[in-house]
């Protein structure tokens, strides 16, 4: 249940604190590498990488076609890595095709990167299982 909090609507202009913020001075956020694009085949595994660095430590969220990516046990997962985050999709289906975006923020700035995953019909590439063709 929601607790009502009586915060007066009378506005007192004393809220821009006149202090130099260490948080601001030391903060940075960098997209270290654009996200990879992948073309692969049905049944394969694809990995998309979001490579960011920053201070305070960035949080990363994944979107597919502008909707938040929902993890699926044993098939679709994302996890933190030393370089940012990795999204892995196993047993690919053509419905996995789409625009994948990672959005990273360190609390003070925002960066994002978008990659395309294209899952095609037909046999997998002959080079190696899970082969991904970046373009």
């Amino acid at each position: 249940q929601e607790t009502e909090l009586s915060v007066s609507a009378e506005l007192v202009p004393t809220s821009s604190w006149n202090i130099s913020s260490e948080l601001n001075k030391d903060s940075y956020l960098t997209l270290d590498e654009p996200m990879n694009n992948i073309t692969t085949s049905l049944g394969q595994t694809a990995e998309l990488h979001c490579k960011v660095s920053g201070n305070p430590p960035p949080t990363i969220r994944w979107f597919k076609n502008d909707a938040p990516v929902v993890q699926e046990p044993r098939r679709l997962s994302f996890r933190s890595t030393i370089y940012g985050s990795r999204l892995r999709i196993r047993n690919l289906d053509t419905t996995d095709t789409g625009y994948f975006q990672c959005v990273a923020t360190n609390g003070k700035e925002v960066v994002s990167s978008t990659g395309v995953l294209f899952v095609k019909f037909g046999p997998p590439p002959t080079a190696s299982p899970g082969y991904s063709d970046e373009y």
Epitope: S16, W17, S21, L23, N24, P56, P57, T59, R61, V103, T105, N106, G107, K108, E109, V110, V111, S112
Partner: antibody, heavy 116, light 108 residues
Framework: EVQLLESGGGLVQPGGSLRLSCAAS????????MSWVRQAPGKGLEWVST????????YYTDSVKGRFTISRDNSKNTLYLQMNSLRAEDTAVYYC?????????WGQGTLVTVSS | EIVLTQSPATLSLSPGERATLSCRAS??????LAWYQQKPGQAPRLLIY???NRATGIPARFSGSGSGTDFTLTISSLEPEDFAVYYC??????????FGQGTRLEIK
Amino acid sequence: EVQLLESGGGLVQPGGSLRLSCAASGFTFTSYAMSWVRQAPGKGLEWVSTISGSGGGTYYTDSVKGRFTISRDNSKNTLYLQMNSLRAEDTAVYYCAQGSSIFDYWGQGTLVTVSS
Amino acid sequence: EIVLTQSPATLSLSPGERATLSCRASQSVSSYLAWYQQKPGQAPRLLIYDASNRATGIPARFSGSGSGTDFTLTISSLEPEDFAVYYCQQRSNWPPCTFGQGTRLEIK
């Protein structure tokens, strides 16, 4: 000294529009995302929208998507919130804040009242 | 969306006493939790970010702890100016960031 000064609030009828502004000074405006956070009378805080430093990325809470538009003019160090199709539940004090989700600088707020 | 639940809703204490405010998340937010103080008619003021880092200019009597789903803001010895409303806020799943409903700290 970082300063954020909101303006543009007022009384508007349901279905109406309003444009809020936030004039920023005392920091490198383009280096930071900027956000709007609101507070309904007697209630808690609610994040509304964020725009990246370049203006290329915009993000909204679900309840305002399609109705509100955040923008910035980096040449004027000013943040905007265009609010259309306003509803009674949008009544709140609207604060602009520096950052996307760690808000260490806030403006003094501007009150938006949606009522017939 | 991650829901933050603060307790108690109201805390009545006297100056000089120790205050312990709690914030619980509906799922893990790692250490990505902040605390804000708000006084009537003023904007919120950042106290703690990322669970335990004091913001610039915040007195040492304010400290934050916790990770995952359970967090605590502690004020070691209350000063008269500390009586206010306190909010927790997560940035783990941004966008959106979400706030708790607030704890009112009042003079006993």
